[in-house]
């Protein structure tokens, strides 16, 4: 728990350099996100493909989309889960991180020092051991997060199933209902290829209790979709006299000394380009 209050931001006096004053874990071990670069990567043949069960959510069901002042969050049902880890990990929520229109490079994890445009996190908790995400969040092996790197490219109708509701959650505390859809559509191609490491929540309280799976391949959203994400939301309540745009809501990469990130793929990426045979 924070030593003193729960106010934190990505900018200004309560920005990430100050997080550890109120949230000691933010200055502690196993912090995320990190830069994924070749000299910390090690292939691990035991990293088998994950199975995504109960991810196809019925449109007859309503799911709560919330502006929590830090991101836009979609609540997920407890019968949605990942199979293939040591325990069952049940979904609790997904949210995104992004940059701003002038610098649209707001992913949390970087690859060889390069940011992607944005990043999706699908948060799960160890439901074999703990009754809910809140209880699990500060426990060993408590959380498992799937991270999807997002780049600018073609229009993505699946991501638009979230983005089309942003106007109803413009301000902190606002909530809207989203029809269920297949959450697996938000994942990239070849989900069997991923990075795996032990890390933390990337927001306060920064608990070092997360098993990270960062998919190797990015998904694409259009420039218009990215711009909508970067311009639609505010960190402040509707009646706040000093509104603050919700931009650059990503944490800087953290030091990652004397540890390894394991990959489910051997690192040679086969390139096929027009004109090459």
């Amino acid at each position: 728990a924070p030593v003193n209050g729960s106010k934190w931001t990505y900018f200004g006096p309560d920005g990430e350099n100050s997080w550890s004053k109120k949230y000691p874990s933010c200055g502690g071990l196993l912090q995320s996100p990190i830069d994924l670069h070749s000299d910390i990567l090690q292939y691990d043949a035991s990293l088998t493909p994950l199975e995504f069960q109960g991810y196809n959510l019925s449109a007859n069901k309503q799911f709560l989309l919330t502006n929590n002042g830090h991101s836009v969050k979609l609540n997920l049902p407890s019968d949605m889960h990942i199979q293939g880890l040591q325990s069952r990990y049940s979904a609790t929520q997904l949210h995104l991180h992004w940059g701003n229109p002038n610098d649209p490079h707001g992913s949390e994890h970087t690859v060889s020092g390069q940011h992607f445009a944005a990043e999706l996190h699908i948060v799960h908790y160890n439901s074999d051991l703990y009754p809910d995400a809140s209880t699990a969040s500060n426990k060993s092996e408590g959380l498992a997060v799937l991270a999807v790197l997002i780049e600018m490219g073609s229009f993505n109708p699946s991501y638009d199933k979230i983005f089309s509701h942003l106007q109803h959650v413009k301000y902190k505390g606002q909530e809207a209902f989203v029809p269920g859809f297949n959450i697996e559509e938000l994942l990239p191609e070849r989900t069997a290829e991923y990075y795996r490491y032990r890390g933390s929540l990337t927001t306060p309280p920064c608990n070092p209790t997360v098993l990270w799976t960062v998919f190797r391949n990015p998904v694409q959203i259009s420039q218009e979709q990215l711009l909508a994400l970067e311009t639609a939301l505010y960190c402040t309540h509707m009646d706040d006299p000093s509104p603050r745009e919700m931009i650059n809501n990503f944490r800087q990469v953290q030091k990652f000394d004397e540890r390894l990130v394991y990959t489910s793929f051997s690192q040679v990426q086969v390139c096929t380009a027009a004109g090459l045979s």
Epitope: N60, L64, S78, D79, H168, A176, F177, P179
Partner: antibody
């Protein structure tokens, strides 16, 4: 025929609690959420909360958070609304209802007949 | 919360009259739904998705609007139309209903 039937209403003392039932039939029970909506005498409709019968996940109107608890018994195709610390203003007809998705939105296509709860000493 | 204000709260009209009920939302909503309720009965779905008539609803009913202003119109009032009509939005949590418009016989 799709049906929702509420029961459990009656006279309750102020400060007391109620437990209402909503029995569903005629459709695949876990495919739709069940909502509770109430209507005070001569007043409008007010949403209390809902439950996903497939997993028991609940969402409440903030106004009722902490005082209302919705639960489900899948084996009986029945949802329950428990409300505590009742006051006179909780006197209402309580309905359960089922929303259906139609292309781009939901609407309540099936309603129960309602059950009257009177809070009075 | 999105407040839904219906006007008028009640109206008296004669059979054959054209009747318009307005629902104004305090913030923009995507769709509006309408329910009909008769005394001692549960509400019935009447118009959904702003303009779609529910099963069995006569074609003299219509719905329209966008943003914050929506209307339910009865082109020629019939005896069976005397009831209370409620609008409802599902765009924001909590979902909210209007306070109702009671259509009475003049």
């Amino acid at each position: 025929e799709v049906q929702l039937v509420e029961s459990g209403g009656g006279l309750v003392q102020p400060g007391g609690s109620l437990r209402l039932s909503c029995a569903a039939s005629g459709y695949s029970y876990t495919d739709y959420n069940i909502y509770w909506v109430r209507q005070a005498p001569g007043k409008g409709l007010e949403w209390v909360g809902y439950i996903d019968p497939a997993n028991g996940d609940t969402t409440y109107n903030q106004k009722f958070k902490g005082r209302a608890t919705i639960s489900v018994d899948k084996s009986k195709n029945t949802a329950y609304l428990q409300m505590n610390s009742l006051r006179a203003e909780d006197t209402a007809v309580y309905y359960c209802s089922r929303p259906i998705y139609y292309g781009a939105y939901w609407y309540f296509d099936v309603w129960g007949q309602g059950t009257l709860v009177t809070v009075s000493s | 919360d999105i407040q839904m204000t219906q006007s008028p709260s009640s109206l008296s009209a004669s059979v054959g009259d054209r009747v318009t009920i307005t629902c104004r939302a305090s913030s923009s909503v995507t769709y509006m739904h309408w329910y009909q309720q008769k005394p001692g009965k549960a509400p019935k779905p009447w118009i959904y998705g702003t303009s779609m008539l529910a099963s069995g609803v006569p074609s003299r009913f219509s719905g329209s609007g966008s943003g914050t202003d929506f209307t339910l119109t009865i082109s020629s009032l019939q005896p069976e139309d005397f009831a209370t009509y409620y609008c409802q939005q599902w765009s924001s949590n909590p979902l909210t209903f209007g306070q109702g418009t009671k259509v009475e016989i003049k």
